[in-house]
Amino acid sequence: EDELQVIQPEKSVSVAAGESATLRCAMTSLIPVGPIMWFRGAGAGRELIYNQKEGHFPRVTTVSELTKRNNLDFSISISNITPADAGTYYCVKFRKGSPDDVEFKSGAGTELSVRAKPS
């Protein structure tokens, strides 16, 4: 079986302030088992935007029903975008581990730019 790929089909997305931004991500396989997370930025200082497994992310909704059997679409929508949300967002697959899940593969990233709200 082919190794899982993390697909972020847009290199960049531009959204007006106050609107919602949809960031698309899909996996090509259900294996390995483990959650996905969305981060803004890369490296040690990256910011967690969404964790499929746990946490409260009031501005983030998933585009498809993540609990649905065989779901491979992990796209998210972030509401009420502000200039502070600009940056590169990464969809990251983790492999289930004990005691902690282990990062398995990251998407290439989608750069979110924020336009001024139309007057």
């Epitope: 082919d2 697909i7 089909p9 290199k11 960049s12 090509t28 396989s29 679409d73 290439a108 750069e111």
Partner: antibody
Framework: QVQLVQSGAEVKKPGSSVKVSCKAS????????ISWVRQAPGQGLEWMGG????????NYAQKFQGRVTITADESTSTAYMELSSLRSEDTAVYYC??????????????WGRGTLVTVSS | DIVMTQSPDSLAVSLGERATINCKSS????????????LAWYQQKPGQPPKLLIY???TRESGVPDRFSGSGSGTDFTLTISSLQAEDVAVYYC?????????FGGGTKVEIK
């Protein structure tokens, strides 16, 4: 080794439609986008539109919007391009081409051999 | 849409000599997030589909001979064939992939002098 295998040449009347297929032989569509690029006789390359089968969504060049429909069947690893309201200027070789979204380089790394569509009354 | 302009339209070069093709984009094809230029070069021989030679402006596709090289950044790019071989006779196209729709240059026909 993956190949993109296209359907055979077509001769069509003006005003009719044509549907061309592109099958990924020896592989799947899972981490790819499939685009359609046409080349009129002696001319350059023109992108018509593309689809990401894993998402099922297509996007089209403005020039072809409303006249072209691109679809994909993941179960058979086949993409389709249908062009309607054909006119003589649509006579061209139509290529399907693959972008490997997993690699993030976004260029067309694999091409079908092309399907010649001739529009003539 | 980003307009890609190639020059010259055609080029005749002696066997073993250098061939240089230029490509200019109407906007930068540099993607700031990864500092890559989303510019590719293709070779098309008569009756065949295009073949990817170079991507990210200067990265050779697997199996492409090292006499082919790409350079440039931003809006100005060059494809160089360091020592032209008979099998290099073809039309060469540049293409940007930084934004939709992907757009191609008009092509440069390379012939033997």
């Amino acid at each position: 080794q993956v190949q993109l295998v296209q359907s055979g040449a077509e001769v069509k009347k003006p005003g009719s439609s044509v549907k061309v297929s592109c099958k990924a032989s020896g592989g799947t569509f899972s981490s790819y986008a499939i685009s359609w690029v046409r080349q009129a006789p002696g001319q350059g390359l023109e992108w018509m539109g593309g689809i990401i089968p894993i998402f099922g969504t297509a996007n089209y060049a403005q020039k072809f919007q409303g006249r072209v429909t691109i679809t994909a069947d993941e179960s058979t690893s086949t993409a389709y391009m249908e062009l309607s309201s054909l006119r003589s200027e649509d006579t061209a070789v139509y290529y399907c081409a693959r972008q490997d979204l997993g690699s993030s380089h976004w260029h067309f790394d694999l091409w079908g051999r092309g399907t010649l569509v001739t529009v003539s009354s | 849409d980003i307009v890609m302009t190639q020059s010259p339209d055609s080029l005749a070069v002696s066997l073993g000599e250098r061939a240089t093709i230029n490509c200019k984009s109407s906007q930068s094809v540099l993607f700031s997030s990864n500092n890559k230029n989303y510019l590719a070069w293709y070779q098309q021989k008569p009756g065949q589909p295009p073949k990817l030679l170079i991507y990210w402006a200067s990265t050779r596709e697997s199996g492409v001979p090292d006499r082919f090289s790409g350079s440039g950044s931003g809006t100005d790019f060059t494809l160089t064939i360091s020592s032209l071989q008979a099998e290099d006779v073809a039309v060469y196209y540049c293409q940007q992939a930084v934004s939709d729709p992907p757009t191609f240059g008009g092509g440069t026909k390379v012939e033997i002098k």
